[in-house]
Interface confidence: medium
């Protein structure tokens, strides 16, 4: 039975040229996290494997940094980075938990961080 919940940074906005941290946190379960995948739509950004470490997709290597923790830092943001991001937690014995973050990259300097929220 899957009892865990994923808390994410929710809907967030950031300035063009800036950076942002995508963060998910799995709670309310004792399952072992074997791997976390970070994906944008159908593209794999990065994986953090419990045993094999972090691996960033080559096409994102210049602008994506691992961490903090199991999160992901996006740098040199462009308007094209606007969209949905998913953290996919593979766990044993529970299975797979998925969190969603929507990032909006703004031209102006009035970008504000959205509130945190939980995905059941």
């Amino acid at each position: 039975m899957m009892t865990g919940t994923i808390e994410t940074t929710g809907n967030i906005s950031a300035e063009k040229g800036g950076s942002i941290i995508l963060q998910c946190h799995l709670s309310s379960t004792t399952a072992q996290v074997t791997q976390v995948n970070w994906e944008q739509q159908d593209q794999l950004l990065a994986i953090c494997n419990a045993d094999l470490g972090w691996h960033i997709s080559p096409s994102f290597k210049d602008r994506v940094a691992p961490g903090p923790g199991l999160g992901l830092t996006l740098q040199s943001l462009t308007v094209n980075d606007t969209g949905e991001y998913f953290c996919i937690y593979h766990t044993y014995p529970d299975g797979t938990y998925t969190g969603r973050i929507f990032l909006e990259v703004l031209e102006s300097s009035v970008a504000e961080h959205g509130a945190r929220f939980q995905i059941p």
């Epitope: 074997t34 419990a50 045993d51 470490g53 766990t91 044993y92 014995p93 299975g95 797979t96």
Partner: nanobody, 120 residues
């Protein structure tokens, strides 16, 4: 210590197929993950595919550049991982390494690599 030995590399024409094997021996406890990585001449080692415990089974993750062409699987009874590579391209030319989680969580063991050359 775990020993990993890759085999199956060689010279193949574009569009061809190869199947790589990675045999593990030594002090193997419960395995969480086995992965394949590659390093082309003059480039960094990059992630290719990984198979990871999740829920009641295993999940696979692929680099975008090989998705739909490569398949990773593992035979737990033989402590062996495989990488089936189809529709090979010249840019797949590299030394292919396998990695496996070791007894110590957070570390991994690596093989010596097998060379795959895709050329006419």
């Amino acid at each position: 210590e775990v020993q990993l030995v890759e085999s199956g590399g060689g010279l193949v024409q574009p569009g061809g197929s190869l199947r790589l094997s990675c045999a593990a021996s030594g002090r193997i406890f419960r395995r969480n993950s086995m992965g394949w990585f590659r390093q082309a001449p003059g480039k960094e080692r990059e992630f290719v595919a990984v198979i990871t415990r999740s829920g009641g089974g295993e999940v696979t993750t692929y680099a975008d550049s090989v998705k739909g062409r490569f398949t990773i699987n593992a035979d737990n009874s033989k402590n062996t991982a495989y990488l089936q590579m189809n529709s090979l391209k010249p840019e797949d030319t590299a030394v292919y390494y396998c990695a496996m989680s070791s007894v110590t969580r957070g570390s991994s063991d690596w093989g010596q690599g097998t060379l795959v050359t895709v050329s006419t």
